[in-house]
Protein backbone atom coordinates (compact mmCIF):
# COMPACT_ATOMS: atom_id res chain seq x y z
CA UNK A 1 0.00 0.00 0.00
CA UNK A 2 1.39 3.29 -0.51
CA UNK A 3 4.32 2.67 -2.91
CA UNK A 4 5.32 3.40 -6.53
CA UNK A 5 7.49 1.68 -9.36
CA UNK A 6 10.15 4.72 -10.43
CA UNK A 7 12.69 3.96 -12.93
CA UNK A 8 15.17 6.12 -14.75
CA UNK A 9 18.68 5.80 -16.52
CA UNK A 10 22.34 6.31 -14.78
CA UNK A 11 23.76 9.53 -15.65
CA UNK A 12 20.47 11.10 -16.12
CA UNK A 13 18.05 13.10 -14.22
CA UNK A 14 15.42 10.92 -12.15
CA UNK A 15 12.92 12.76 -9.84
CA UNK A 16 10.47 10.77 -7.90
CA UNK A 17 7.31 11.92 -6.21
CA UNK A 18 6.33 10.63 -3.06
CA UNK A 19 3.37 8.23 -3.46
CA UNK A 20 1.95 9.53 -0.13
CA UNK A 21 -0.81 12.31 -1.17
CA UNK A 22 -0.10 15.19 1.14
CA UNK A 23 -0.99 18.87 0.36
CA UNK A 24 1.84 21.27 -0.84
CA UNK A 25 3.90 22.97 1.77
CA UNK A 26 3.85 20.33 4.26
CA UNK A 27 7.15 18.94 5.82
CA UNK A 28 7.89 15.97 3.66
CA UNK A 29 11.24 13.56 5.62
CA UNK A 30 12.85 10.55 2.61
CA UNK A 31 14.60 7.83 3.95
CA UNK A 32 16.62 5.43 2.20
CA UNK A 33 14.58 2.52 3.50
CA UNK A 34 17.50 -0.46 3.76
CA UNK A 35 19.74 1.30 6.12
CA UNK A 36 16.93 4.39 7.62
CA UNK A 37 19.13 6.49 6.33
CA UNK A 38 18.00 10.20 6.45
CA UNK A 39 18.17 11.47 2.99
CA UNK A 40 19.59 14.96 3.36
CA UNK A 41 17.77 17.82 1.88
CA UNK A 42 21.37 20.37 0.64
CA UNK A 43 21.15 20.29 -2.84
CA UNK A 44 24.97 20.32 -2.78
CA UNK A 45 24.01 16.25 -2.52
CA UNK A 46 23.85 14.02 -5.51
CA UNK A 47 20.72 12.32 -4.70
CA UNK A 48 18.81 14.92 -2.41
CA UNK A 49 15.31 15.37 -0.87
CA UNK A 50 12.79 18.61 -1.72
CA UNK A 51 9.29 18.48 -0.36
CA UNK A 52 7.78 16.10 -1.99
CA UNK A 53 10.13 15.10 -4.53
CA UNK A 54 13.07 12.88 -4.42
CA UNK A 55 15.93 14.03 -6.71
CA UNK A 56 18.93 12.43 -8.26
CA UNK A 57 21.02 14.60 -9.96
CA UNK A 58 22.55 12.20 -11.83
CA UNK A 59 20.93 8.68 -10.91
CA UNK A 60 23.20 5.50 -10.55
CA UNK A 61 22.48 1.95 -10.70
CA UNK A 62 23.66 2.05 -7.04
CA UNK A 63 20.64 4.33 -6.19
CA UNK A 64 18.58 1.27 -6.35
CA UNK A 65 16.36 0.52 -3.60
CA UNK A 66 13.00 1.19 -1.75
CA UNK A 67 12.86 4.70 -0.26
CA UNK A 68 10.55 5.85 2.26
CA UNK A 69 8.62 9.22 2.76
CA UNK A 70 6.86 10.64 5.92
CA UNK A 71 4.25 13.39 4.81
CA UNK A 72 4.71 15.12 8.67
CA UNK A 73 1.90 16.50 10.97
CA UNK A 74 2.40 17.25 14.91
CA UNK A 75 -0.68 14.92 14.65
CA UNK A 76 -0.86 12.59 11.79
CA UNK A 77 2.21 11.16 9.50
CA UNK A 78 1.71 9.35 6.24
CA UNK A 79 4.15 7.26 5.32
CA UNK A 80 4.35 6.22 1.09
CA UNK A 81 7.34 3.97 -0.41
CA UNK A 82 9.46 4.48 -3.98
CA UNK A 83 10.40 1.49 -5.42
CA UNK A 84 13.26 3.18 -7.51
CA UNK A 85 15.66 1.13 -10.21
CA UNK A 86 18.27 2.81 -12.51
CA UNK A 87 19.08 1.20 -14.74
CA UNK A 88 22.83 1.22 -17.06
CA UNK A 89 22.52 2.38 -20.59
CA UNK A 90 21.91 0.28 -23.67
CA UNK A 91 24.82 -0.19 -25.71
CA UNK A 92 22.05 -0.51 -29.06
CA UNK A 93 18.98 1.29 -30.20
CA UNK A 94 16.47 -1.21 -28.50
CA UNK A 95 14.49 -0.23 -25.33
CA UNK A 96 13.30 -2.99 -23.14
CA UNK A 97 10.12 -3.08 -21.88
CA UNK A 98 10.88 -2.47 -18.40
CA UNK A 99 11.91 0.99 -19.59
CA UNK A 100 8.66 1.65 -21.19
CA UNK A 101 5.48 4.11 -19.95
CA UNK A 102 2.12 2.83 -20.81
CA UNK A 103 1.40 3.00 -25.15
CA UNK A 104 -0.73 5.30 -26.58
CA UNK A 105 -2.61 5.50 -29.30
CA UNK A 106 -3.32 7.57 -32.07
CA UNK A 107 -5.38 8.50 -35.30
CA UNK A 108 -5.73 10.86 -37.99
CA UNK A 109 -7.94 12.87 -35.94
CA UNK A 110 -6.13 13.04 -32.59
CA UNK A 111 -1.90 12.45 -32.74
CA UNK A 112 -0.36 13.42 -29.61
CA UNK A 113 2.10 11.72 -27.74
CA UNK A 114 2.62 13.11 -24.14
CA UNK A 115 6.44 12.98 -22.70
CA UNK A 116 6.07 10.52 -19.76
CA UNK A 117 6.81 12.13 -16.30
CA UNK A 118 7.76 15.75 -17.35
CA UNK A 119 5.80 17.59 -14.94
CA UNK A 120 8.15 16.27 -12.36
CA UNK A 121 11.12 18.57 -13.92
CA UNK A 122 11.96 22.05 -14.67
CA UNK A 123 12.69 22.18 -18.24
CA UNK A 124 12.22 24.46 -21.03
CA UNK A 125 10.74 23.44 -24.46
CA UNK A 126 11.81 22.41 -27.12
CA UNK A 127 11.33 18.81 -26.09
CA UNK A 128 13.91 16.56 -28.67
CA UNK A 129 11.51 13.54 -30.30
CA UNK A 130 13.26 10.05 -31.42
CA UNK A 131 11.43 7.28 -32.93
CA UNK A 132 13.19 3.96 -32.67
CA UNK A 133 16.16 6.14 -32.35
CA UNK A 134 16.15 8.24 -35.25
CA UNK A 135 15.83 11.95 -34.44
CA UNK A 136 12.35 13.15 -35.58
CA UNK A 137 12.32 15.36 -39.04
CA UNK A 138 10.38 16.79 -40.93
CA UNK A 139 7.11 18.90 -41.22
CA UNK A 140 4.97 16.20 -40.05
CA UNK A 141 6.42 16.85 -36.72
CA UNK A 142 5.37 19.19 -34.37
CA UNK A 143 7.12 19.41 -30.46
CA UNK A 144 4.48 21.61 -28.61
CA UNK A 145 4.87 21.77 -25.22
CA UNK A 146 4.78 18.54 -23.35
CA UNK A 147 3.93 16.54 -26.41
CA UNK A 148 4.33 15.69 -29.91
CA UNK A 149 2.26 16.17 -32.57
CA UNK A 150 2.09 13.94 -35.74
CA UNK A 151 0.13 15.33 -38.42
CA UNK A 152 -1.40 13.21 -41.61
CA UNK A 153 -0.39 9.59 -39.24
CA UNK A 154 -0.26 6.60 -41.11
CA UNK A 155 0.34 3.18 -40.40
CA UNK A 156 3.64 3.31 -39.92
CA UNK A 157 3.97 5.94 -37.60
CA UNK A 158 3.58 3.08 -34.56
CA UNK A 159 6.90 2.38 -33.10
CA UNK A 160 8.83 3.49 -29.85
CA UNK A 161 8.93 7.11 -29.38
CA UNK A 162 11.79 8.82 -27.08
CA UNK A 163 10.73 12.44 -26.23
CA UNK A 164 14.28 13.96 -24.31
CA UNK A 165 14.80 17.25 -22.22
CA UNK A 166 17.40 18.98 -20.14
CA UNK A 167 16.43 19.21 -16.42
CA UNK A 168 17.82 22.58 -14.41
CA UNK A 169 18.52 22.21 -11.23
CA UNK A 170 20.64 25.52 -9.75
CA UNK A 171 22.50 26.09 -13.04
CA UNK A 172 23.26 22.69 -13.71
CA UNK A 173 21.92 20.78 -16.68
CA UNK A 174 20.63 16.82 -16.27
CA UNK A 175 19.54 14.81 -19.40
CA UNK A 176 16.34 13.26 -18.66
CA UNK A 177 14.50 10.44 -21.56
CA UNK A 178 11.39 8.50 -21.59
CA UNK A 179 9.82 6.32 -24.41
CA UNK A 180 6.61 4.89 -24.79
CA UNK A 181 4.86 3.28 -27.57
CA UNK A 182 2.87 4.71 -30.18
CA UNK A 183 0.09 2.44 -32.23
CA UNK A 184 -2.02 3.87 -35.16
CA UNK A 185 -5.82 3.08 -35.26
CA UNK A 186 -7.39 2.87 -38.74
CA UNK A 187 -9.56 5.61 -39.70
CA UNK A 188 -11.77 3.08 -42.25
CA UNK A 189 -14.78 1.85 -41.34
CA UNK A 190 -17.99 2.94 -39.66
CA UNK A 191 -19.60 2.92 -35.78
CA UNK A 192 -22.63 1.06 -34.02
CA UNK A 193 -24.00 1.25 -30.60
CA UNK A 194 -21.58 -0.51 -28.63
CA UNK A 195 -22.53 -4.44 -28.06
CA UNK A 196 -21.15 -5.77 -24.89
CA UNK A 197 -19.89 -9.43 -25.41
CA UNK A 198 -18.96 -10.28 -22.08
CA UNK A 199 -19.55 -10.31 -19.12
CA UNK A 200 -23.92 -11.07 -19.74
CA UNK A 201 -26.34 -8.96 -18.21
CA UNK A 202 -26.71 -9.54 -14.47
CA UNK A 203 -24.00 -11.92 -15.07
CA UNK A 204 -23.10 -13.61 -11.23
CA UNK A 205 -19.43 -14.77 -11.23
CA UNK A 206 -18.61 -17.02 -8.52
CA UNK A 207 -15.16 -16.01 -6.62
CA UNK A 208 -13.08 -17.79 -3.92
CA UNK A 209 -12.46 -15.30 -0.96
CA UNK A 210 -8.88 -15.04 -0.44
CA UNK A 211 -7.82 -15.49 -4.07
CA UNK A 212 -7.34 -13.15 -7.11
CA UNK A 213 -10.35 -12.91 -9.95
CA UNK A 214 -10.34 -10.85 -13.05
CA UNK A 215 -13.31 -9.72 -14.54
CA UNK A 216 -13.33 -8.70 -18.20
CA UNK A 217 -15.51 -6.16 -20.10
CA UNK A 218 -15.34 -6.80 -23.74
CA UNK A 219 -17.13 -4.96 -26.10
CA UNK A 220 -17.44 -4.17 -29.93
CA UNK A 221 -18.08 -0.90 -31.43
CA UNK A 222 -17.81 -1.41 -35.66
CA UNK A 223 -15.65 -1.29 -38.13
CA UNK A 224 -12.50 -0.08 -38.10
CA UNK A 225 -11.00 2.88 -36.05
CA UNK A 226 -13.22 4.04 -33.33
CA UNK A 227 -13.40 7.43 -32.48
CA UNK A 228 -14.46 8.10 -28.63
CA UNK A 229 -15.16 4.79 -28.15
CA UNK A 230 -14.50 3.16 -24.57
CA UNK A 231 -14.84 0.68 -21.98
CA UNK A 232 -14.39 1.24 -18.67
CA UNK A 233 -15.69 -0.65 -15.05
CA UNK A 234 -17.35 1.01 -12.29
CA UNK A 235 -18.33 -0.02 -8.70
CA UNK A 236 -21.04 1.09 -7.67
CA UNK A 237 -21.56 3.79 -10.13
CA UNK A 238 -17.80 4.87 -9.17
CA UNK A 239 -14.83 5.32 -11.53
CA UNK A 240 -12.36 2.72 -10.25
CA UNK A 241 -9.97 5.49 -10.12
CA UNK A 242 -12.17 7.17 -7.53
CA UNK A 243 -13.58 4.74 -5.77
CA UNK A 244 -9.89 4.47 -4.11
CA UNK A 245 -9.38 0.45 -3.20
CA UNK A 246 -6.12 -0.36 -4.08
CA UNK A 247 -6.92 -4.20 -4.64
CA UNK A 248 -9.17 -3.66 -7.38
CA UNK A 249 -7.19 -2.18 -10.45
CA UNK A 250 -8.00 -1.90 -14.46
CA UNK A 251 -5.70 -3.32 -16.23
CA UNK A 252 -3.88 -0.32 -17.69
CA UNK A 253 -4.80 1.24 -21.40
CA UNK A 254 -7.34 -0.56 -23.03
CA UNK A 255 -6.42 -3.57 -25.39
CA UNK A 256 -8.07 -3.23 -29.26
CA UNK A 257 -8.60 -6.45 -31.33
CA UNK A 258 -10.48 -6.89 -34.31
CA UNK A 259 -13.15 -10.10 -34.32
CA UNK A 260 -14.37 -10.74 -37.69
CA UNK A 261 -13.70 -6.93 -39.05
CA UNK A 262 -15.05 -5.54 -35.75
CA UNK A 263 -13.49 -2.97 -33.78
CA UNK A 264 -13.44 -4.22 -29.98
CA UNK A 265 -11.93 -3.42 -26.92
CA UNK A 266 -11.67 -5.38 -23.69
CA UNK A 267 -10.67 -4.11 -20.44
CA UNK A 268 -9.69 -6.41 -17.23
CA UNK A 269 -10.92 -5.55 -13.84
CA UNK A 270 -8.95 -7.21 -11.49
CA UNK A 271 -9.51 -7.89 -7.98
CA UNK A 272 -6.40 -9.21 -5.67
CA UNK A 273 -7.21 -11.60 -2.55
CA UNK A 274 -11.16 -11.19 -2.90
CA UNK A 275 -12.62 -10.10 0.68
CA UNK A 276 -16.46 -10.45 1.62
CA UNK A 277 -17.03 -7.21 1.01
CA UNK A 278 -16.45 -7.15 -2.72
CA UNK A 279 -19.46 -9.45 -2.81
CA UNK A 280 -21.65 -7.30 -2.15
CA UNK A 281 -20.06 -4.27 -4.74
CA UNK A 282 -22.08 -3.98 -7.88
CA UNK A 283 -19.75 -4.74 -10.80
CA UNK A 284 -20.69 -2.50 -14.07
CA UNK A 285 -19.10 -3.08 -17.60
CA UNK A 286 -19.90 0.06 -19.64
CA UNK A 287 -19.12 0.66 -23.09
CA UNK A 288 -19.73 4.17 -24.39
CA UNK A 289 -19.04 5.59 -28.06
CA UNK A 290 -20.77 8.63 -29.77
CA UNK A 291 -23.69 6.78 -30.95
CA UNK A 292 -24.84 6.16 -26.50
CA UNK A 293 -23.71 3.53 -23.48
CA UNK A 294 -24.47 0.32 -22.76
CA UNK A 295 -24.14 -1.34 -19.80
CA UNK A 296 -23.88 -4.42 -18.28
CA UNK A 297 -23.80 -5.97 -14.59
CA UNK A 298 -22.16 -8.28 -12.75
CA UNK A 299 -21.97 -9.36 -9.20
CA UNK A 300 -19.72 -11.54 -7.53
CA UNK A 301 -20.46 -14.86 -5.58
CA UNK A 302 -19.08 -17.07 -3.11
CA UNK A 303 -17.82 -20.27 -4.57
CA UNK A 304 -17.05 -22.77 -1.94
CA UNK A 305 -13.34 -24.46 -2.35
CA UNK A 306 -13.55 -28.43 -3.54
CA UNK A 307 -12.93 -30.29 -0.32
CA UNK A 308 -10.22 -32.85 -0.95
CA UNK A 309 -10.12 -36.04 1.05
CA UNK A 310 -7.57 -38.83 0.69
CA UNK B 1 -15.25 13.79 -6.84
CA UNK B 2 -15.60 12.78 -3.33
CA UNK B 3 -18.62 13.39 -1.79
CA UNK B 4 -19.58 12.86 2.35
CA UNK B 5 -23.75 12.83 3.32
CA UNK B 6 -24.62 12.62 6.74
CA UNK B 7 -27.90 10.49 7.54
CA UNK B 8 -30.06 9.28 10.61
CA UNK B 9 -32.37 10.26 13.09
CA UNK B 10 -33.35 13.98 13.04
CA UNK B 11 -34.85 13.57 16.69
CA UNK B 12 -33.15 12.08 19.50
CA UNK B 13 -34.61 11.69 23.34
CA UNK B 14 -33.12 12.46 25.87
CA UNK B 15 -30.87 9.69 27.79
CA UNK B 16 -30.98 8.20 24.37
CA UNK B 17 -27.63 7.24 21.42
CA UNK B 18 -27.47 9.51 18.76
CA UNK B 19 -26.48 7.41 15.49
CA UNK B 20 -25.40 8.95 12.30
CA UNK B 21 -23.85 7.66 9.17
CA UNK B 22 -21.43 9.53 6.92
CA UNK B 23 -21.79 7.64 3.27
CA UNK B 24 -18.79 8.77 0.95
CA UNK B 25 -18.98 8.26 -2.31
CA UNK B 26 -15.66 8.76 -4.86
CA UNK B 27 -13.12 7.65 -2.75
CA UNK B 28 -12.72 4.39 -0.19
CA UNK B 29 -12.29 5.47 3.28
CA UNK B 30 -10.02 2.39 3.88
CA UNK B 31 -7.41 3.86 1.42
CA UNK B 32 -6.22 7.06 3.15
CA UNK B 33 -7.10 9.96 4.87
CA UNK B 34 -8.59 10.93 8.74
CA UNK B 35 -12.87 11.12 8.40
CA UNK B 36 -14.00 13.16 11.14
CA UNK B 37 -17.32 14.26 12.45
CA UNK B 38 -17.90 18.29 13.55
CA UNK B 39 -20.75 19.74 15.14
CA UNK B 40 -22.31 23.05 15.55
CA UNK B 41 -24.84 23.83 17.69
CA UNK B 42 -27.86 26.50 16.40
CA UNK B 43 -26.01 29.84 16.18
CA UNK B 44 -22.73 28.48 17.08
CA UNK B 45 -19.47 27.39 16.70
CA UNK B 46 -17.89 24.52 15.41
CA UNK B 47 -16.40 21.59 18.04
CA UNK B 48 -14.22 18.71 16.18
CA UNK B 49 -15.78 15.34 17.92
CA UNK B 50 -13.33 13.05 16.71
CA UNK B 51 -12.22 10.72 13.44
CA UNK B 52 -10.99 7.63 12.53
CA UNK B 53 -8.57 7.18 9.91
CA UNK B 54 -7.82 4.79 7.09
CA UNK B 55 -6.74 1.85 8.74
CA UNK B 56 -9.63 1.96 11.60
CA UNK B 57 -7.56 3.60 14.29
CA UNK B 58 -9.74 6.25 16.15
CA UNK B 59 -8.63 9.67 17.70
CA UNK B 60 -11.45 11.37 19.98
CA UNK B 61 -12.07 14.71 21.88
CA UNK B 62 -11.39 14.24 25.57
CA UNK B 63 -14.53 16.68 26.53
CA UNK B 64 -16.89 13.60 24.74
CA UNK B 65 -14.38 10.81 24.59
CA UNK B 66 -16.51 8.44 27.37
CA UNK B 67 -19.18 9.15 25.55
CA UNK B 68 -18.71 8.79 21.68
CA UNK B 69 -17.97 5.74 19.22
CA UNK B 70 -16.41 6.17 15.91
CA UNK B 71 -16.97 3.07 13.58
CA UNK B 72 -16.39 2.05 9.93
CA UNK B 73 -18.27 -0.38 8.00
CA UNK B 74 -15.90 -0.91 4.96
CA UNK B 75 -18.53 -2.81 3.11
CA UNK B 76 -20.91 0.19 2.57
CA UNK B 77 -17.56 3.09 2.92
CA UNK B 78 -19.11 4.19 5.44
CA UNK B 79 -18.40 5.87 8.80
CA UNK B 80 -20.60 5.96 11.77
CA UNK B 81 -20.83 8.30 15.27
CA UNK B 82 -22.28 7.04 18.20
CA UNK B 83 -22.87 9.14 21.14
CA UNK B 84 -24.38 8.26 24.28
CA UNK B 85 -26.52 9.59 26.58
CA UNK B 86 -27.05 12.86 25.18
CA UNK B 87 -28.81 15.72 26.72
CA UNK B 88 -30.37 19.31 25.11
CA UNK B 89 -27.12 20.39 24.93
CA UNK B 90 -25.77 17.71 21.83
CA UNK B 91 -28.60 19.22 19.56
CA UNK B 92 -26.33 20.53 16.69
CA UNK B 93 -26.00 20.36 13.14
CA UNK B 94 -23.63 16.88 12.66
CA UNK B 95 -20.91 17.01 9.51
CA UNK B 96 -19.14 14.59 8.49
CA UNK B 97 -15.66 15.80 6.60
CA UNK B 98 -12.02 14.21 5.26
CA UNK B 99 -8.79 15.26 6.50
CA UNK B 100 -6.21 14.68 4.50
CA UNK B 101 -3.16 15.87 6.81
CA UNK B 102 -4.91 18.17 9.47
CA UNK B 103 -7.43 20.02 7.75
CA UNK B 104 -10.26 19.26 6.45
CA UNK B 105 -11.38 19.74 2.89
CA UNK B 106 -14.04 17.70 1.87
CA UNK B 107 -17.45 18.54 3.72
CA UNK B 108 -20.89 16.82 3.93
CA UNK B 109 -24.23 18.88 3.79
CA UNK B 110 -24.77 18.54 8.02
CA UNK B 111 -27.75 16.85 9.37
CA UNK B 112 -29.43 18.41 12.35
CA UNK B 113 -29.95 16.55 15.45
CA UNK B 114 -32.22 17.84 17.69
CA UNK B 115 -32.41 16.20 21.53
CA UNK B 116 -36.14 16.47 23.32
CA UNK B 117 -38.72 14.63 24.79
CA UNK C 1 -6.62 22.43 25.09
CA UNK C 2 -5.85 25.45 23.40
CA UNK C 3 -8.00 28.14 22.95
CA UNK C 4 -8.53 30.34 19.70
CA UNK C 5 -10.18 33.40 20.20
CA UNK C 6 -11.41 35.31 17.04
CA UNK C 7 -11.76 39.20 16.70
CA UNK C 8 -13.78 41.29 15.73
CA UNK C 9 -16.39 39.24 16.19
CA UNK C 10 -18.36 40.90 13.48
CA UNK C 11 -16.97 43.54 10.96
CA UNK C 12 -18.87 45.09 8.38
CA UNK C 13 -16.90 45.66 5.07
CA UNK C 14 -17.64 47.51 1.82
CA UNK C 15 -16.94 45.64 -1.57
CA UNK C 16 -13.27 46.40 -2.37
CA UNK C 17 -12.24 47.54 0.76
CA UNK C 18 -9.78 44.95 3.07
CA UNK C 19 -11.15 42.95 5.98
CA UNK C 20 -8.87 41.77 8.28
CA UNK C 21 -9.86 39.00 11.09
CA UNK C 22 -7.44 37.65 13.82
CA UNK C 23 -7.15 34.37 15.53
CA UNK C 24 -5.21 34.13 19.13
CA UNK C 25 -4.18 30.80 20.38
CA UNK C 26 -3.69 30.36 24.17
CA UNK C 27 -0.07 28.33 23.44
CA UNK C 28 1.77 28.32 20.55
CA UNK C 29 0.71 26.54 17.44
CA UNK C 30 3.77 26.91 15.68
CA UNK C 31 6.60 23.49 15.55
CA UNK C 32 9.48 22.36 13.03
CA UNK C 33 9.17 25.66 10.75
CA UNK C 34 5.35 25.08 10.13
CA UNK C 35 2.50 26.97 11.71
CA UNK C 36 -0.89 24.53 11.93
CA UNK C 37 -3.55 26.58 11.88
CA UNK C 38 -6.38 27.49 8.97
CA UNK C 39 -8.79 29.00 7.97
CA UNK C 40 -12.41 28.27 6.82
CA UNK C 41 -15.67 30.16 5.53
CA UNK C 42 -19.06 29.39 6.14
CA UNK C 43 -22.30 30.66 4.57
CA UNK C 44 -25.74 30.25 5.52
CA UNK C 45 -27.01 26.63 5.62
CA UNK C 46 -24.04 25.89 3.80
CA UNK C 47 -20.81 23.40 5.81
CA UNK C 48 -17.70 25.38 6.13
CA UNK C 49 -14.93 25.67 3.17
CA UNK C 50 -11.15 25.46 3.63
CA UNK C 51 -9.68 28.42 2.39
CA UNK C 52 -5.89 28.54 3.77
CA UNK C 53 -4.03 25.69 5.44
CA UNK C 54 -0.77 26.25 7.57
CA UNK C 55 -1.51 29.95 8.11
CA UNK C 56 -0.44 31.31 4.43
CA UNK C 57 -1.28 28.46 2.26
CA UNK C 58 -4.13 28.98 0.25
CA UNK C 59 -6.74 25.92 -0.55
CA UNK C 60 -6.96 24.52 -4.34
CA UNK C 61 -9.44 26.98 -5.84
CA UNK C 62 -9.64 29.71 -3.42
CA UNK C 63 -9.45 33.13 -5.08
CA UNK C 64 -6.03 35.12 -4.36
CA UNK C 65 -8.39 37.83 -2.92
CA UNK C 66 -7.82 35.40 0.55
CA UNK C 67 -4.89 34.91 2.62
CA UNK C 68 -3.31 34.15 5.47
CA UNK C 69 -0.52 34.85 7.96
CA UNK C 70 1.05 34.56 11.40
CA UNK C 71 2.84 32.27 13.33
CA UNK C 72 3.34 30.86 16.97
CA UNK C 73 0.00 32.37 18.73
CA UNK C 74 -1.10 35.19 17.06
CA UNK C 75 -2.89 34.56 12.85
CA UNK C 76 -4.49 36.70 10.64
CA UNK C 77 -7.05 36.12 7.40
CA UNK C 78 -7.52 38.97 4.85
CA UNK C 79 -9.55 39.46 2.27
CA UNK C 80 -8.76 41.97 -0.11
CA UNK C 81 -10.69 43.62 -2.18
CA UNK C 82 -13.31 42.15 -0.28
CA UNK C 83 -16.60 40.90 -2.52
CA UNK C 84 -20.31 40.99 -2.10
CA UNK C 85 -20.27 36.96 -2.04
CA UNK C 86 -17.76 37.35 0.70
CA UNK C 87 -20.65 37.40 3.15
CA UNK C 88 -20.15 34.59 5.21
CA UNK C 89 -18.79 33.52 8.81
CA UNK C 90 -14.94 32.69 9.24
CA UNK C 91 -13.53 30.02 11.67
CA UNK C 92 -9.77 29.46 12.90
CA UNK C 93 -9.03 26.14 13.01
CA UNK C 94 -5.44 24.65 14.60
CA UNK C 95 -4.00 21.39 14.10
CA UNK C 96 -1.27 21.27 16.82
CA UNK C 97 -2.36 18.89 18.72
CA UNK C 98 -5.46 16.69 20.10
CA UNK C 99 -7.99 17.94 20.29
CA UNK C 100 -8.10 20.22 17.01
CA UNK C 101 -10.48 23.16 18.16
CA UNK C 102 -11.96 26.00 16.06
CA UNK C 103 -12.65 30.31 17.32
CA UNK C 104 -15.47 30.79 17.75
CA UNK C 105 -15.81 32.95 14.41
CA UNK C 106 -16.83 35.96 12.70
CA UNK C 107 -19.07 37.34 11.00
CA UNK C 108 -18.30 39.11 7.73
CA UNK C 109 -21.15 41.30 6.57
CA UNK C 110 -21.13 43.33 3.38
CA UNK C 111 -22.12 47.27 3.61
Known amino acids: KFSKQSWGLENEALIVRCPRQGKPSYTVDWYYSQTNKSIPTQERNRVFASGQLLKFLPAAVADSGIYTCIVRSPTFNRTGYANVTIYKKQSDCNVPDYLMYSTVSGSEKNSKIYCPTIDLYNWTAPLEWFKNCQALQGSRYRAHKSFLVIDNVMTEDAGDYTCKFIHNENGANYSVTATRSFTVKDEQGFSLFPVIGAPAQNEIKEVEIGKNANLTCSACFGKGTQFLAAVLWQLNGTKITDFGEPRIQQEEGQNQSFSNGLACLDMVLRIADVKEEDLLLQYDCLALNLHGLRRHTVRLSRKNPIDHHS | QVQLQESGPGLVKPSQTLSLTCTVS?????????WNWIRQPPGKGLEWIGYIDYSGSTTYNPSLKSRVTISVDTSKNQFSLKLSSVTAADTAVYYC??????????WGQGTLVTVSS | DIVLTQSPASLAVSPGQRATITCRAS??????????MHWYQQKPGQPPKLLIYLASNLESGVPARFSGSGSGTDFTLTINPVEANDAANYYCQHSREFPFTFGQGTKVEIK
Open chain 3, 27 to 36: KSVSTSGHSY
Open chain 2, 26 to 34: GYSITSDYA
Open chain 2, 97 to 106: ARTVIDSMDY
